[in-house]
């Protein structure tokens, strides 16, 4: 599996993963005693055929083109989770591994 | 975990898994055996904030609302494999569980 | 109905030739993968070839490779099988097969028989 | 190449009985092993493929098992047309190889 790496200087249009700082406390998110923030990343770019396609079905659906299916889209085709210690809503402190916080590659799905 | 199911009568604008039957004879891919054809289903449809969405992530992002991340979009979010019988290229008949060709859900991602 | 009807059949001496035929009918042939099979008299079966729908991709066992070669006429709705430089080994009763995940229609069979 | 050890080679059984035929694949095929039947002077015909599917218009007293290296197929209530040699087919991968056959006989 592969996927592109960018930062806000690339000139690269095509799917791509871009670094992300989410920041709880600037949400307003005080649920979440820790972490404050994390480096969460995002996709983005332009899907053009067989680019990056994670899956064969999104190239049979290519070919069989059926009604209202639109192309690929830039998505996070890898994504791994983050420890956190934030308060249940039940007055309760909880400390978990949240899935699928963090992409780690983005690809055409 | 949640997804709609819908057929070509529906009105439905959401995202949403549709059924696509795809034949491999009709795209001349002759190195494959069997199935001739297989459900595969596609995922398409409008994905509204908050509608469907597969991952934290996918809303974390949105409250970023960093350069150039376009909302969500539809996407399969669970897949299933078919077991195919091929031709590998090297005069060999293989049999193997083809990973991710059958679209079991879709989501906003 | 399916029908696989194999012909060519016969006495050949050592190191000769032959050519197998089986004309297919009762489905669309050339939509399907064919394999021959053969069966020495009184033994088990043996997997010779395949062939894909249009003929692109072969296989074969390496008993019969070099020697023997599959193909196939979708026009004519007959599939064939070149054997070469036949050996008393490759007498059997060989068999044209419909291919799916499995062989899943048979012909009656032609026998060969390789002997000086 | 992968060898298919079948047994038993032959057994008799009377008309009602279970029979349970194996199969052992000398590495792991998956759900990839088909059932055939063969009457004296006829051409096989294939009963189960991918171990566990029975094929178009095949009694429901076949039924087949298994997958990785050992494989089942069992005749619920053998029938007077079962009498006959069964041979079991890996087609996981060529070159495809067949068992040595079972030869179902009338005790």
């Known amino acids: 599996d592969f996927g592109l790496d960018c930062d806000e200087h690339s000139t690269e249009s095509r799917c791509c993963r871009y670094p992300l700082t989410v920041d709880f406390e600037a949400f307003g998110w005080d649920w979440i005693i820790a972490p404050k923030r994390y480096k969460a990343n995002y996709c983005s770019g332009e899907c053009e055929f067989v680019f990056l396609q994670k899956y064969p079905h999104t190239h049979l659906v290519h070919q069989a083109n059926p009604r209202g299916s639109a192309g690929p889209c830039c998505t996070p085709t890898k994504m791994s989770p983050i420890n956190m210690l934030y308060f249940n809503g039940k007055e309760q402190i909880i400390y978990g591994k949240i899935p699928a916080m963090v992409v780690d590659r983005c690809g055409c799905s | 975990d949640f997804g709609l199911d819908c057929d070509e009568h529906s009105t439905e604008s959401r995202c949403c898994r549709y059924p696509l039957t795809v034949d491999f004879e009709a795209f001349g891919w002759d190195w494959i055996i069997a199935p001739k054809r297989y459900k595969a289903n596609y995922c398409s449809g409008e994905c509204e904030f908050v509608f469907l969405q597969k991952y934290p992530h996918t809303h974390l992002v949105h409250q970023a609302n960093p350069r150039g991340s376009a909302g969500p979009c539809c996407t399969p979010t669970k897949m299933s494999p078919i077991n195919m019988l091929y031709f590998n290229g090297k005069e060999q008949i293989i049999y193997g569980k083809i990973p991710a060709m059958v679209v079991d859900r879709c989501g906003c991602s | 109905e399916v029908q696989l009807l194999e012909s060519g059949g016969g006495l050949v001496q050592p190191g000769g030739s032959l050519r197998l035929s089986c004309a297919a009918s009762?489905?669309?042939?050339?939509?399907?993968?064919m394999s021959w099979v053969r069966q020495a008299p009184g033994k088990g079966l043996e997997w010779v070839s395949t062939?894909?729908?249009?003929?692109?991709?072969?296989s074969y066992p390496d008993s019969v490779k070099g020697r023997f070669t599959i193909s196939r006429d979708n026009s004519k709705n007959t599939l064939y099988l070149q054997m070469n430089s036949l050996r008393a080994e490759d007498t059997a009763v060989y068999y044209c097969?419909?291919?799916?995940?499995?062989?899943?229609?048979w012909g009656q069979g032609t026998l060969v028989t390789v002997s000086s | 190449d992968i060898q298919m050890t079948q047994s038993p080679s032959s057994l008799s059984a009377s008309v009602g009985d279970r029979v349970t035929i194996t199969c052992k694949a000398s590495?792991?095929?998956?759900?990839?092993v088909a059932w055939y039947q063969q009457k004296p002077g006829k051409a096989p015909k294939l009963l189960i493929y991918?171990?566990?599917y029975r094929y178009t218009g095949v009694p429901s007293r076949f039924s087949g098992s298994g997958s990785g290296t050992d494989f089942t197929l069992t005749i619920s209530s053998l029938q007077p047309e079962d009498f006959a040699t069964y041979y079991c087919?890996?087609?996981?991968?060529?070159?495809?190889?067949f068992g040595g056959g079972t030869k179902v006989e009338i005790k």
């Open positions: 097969a419909k291919q799916d995940y499995a062989m899943n229609y």
């Open positions: 009762g489905f669309t042939f050339s939509s399907y993968a």
């Open positions: 062939i894909s729908s249009s003929g692109s991709y072969t």
């Open positions: 590495q792991d095929v998956s759900t990839a």
């Open positions: 991918s171990a566990s």
């Open positions: 087919q890996q087609h996981y991968s060529t070159p495809w190889t």
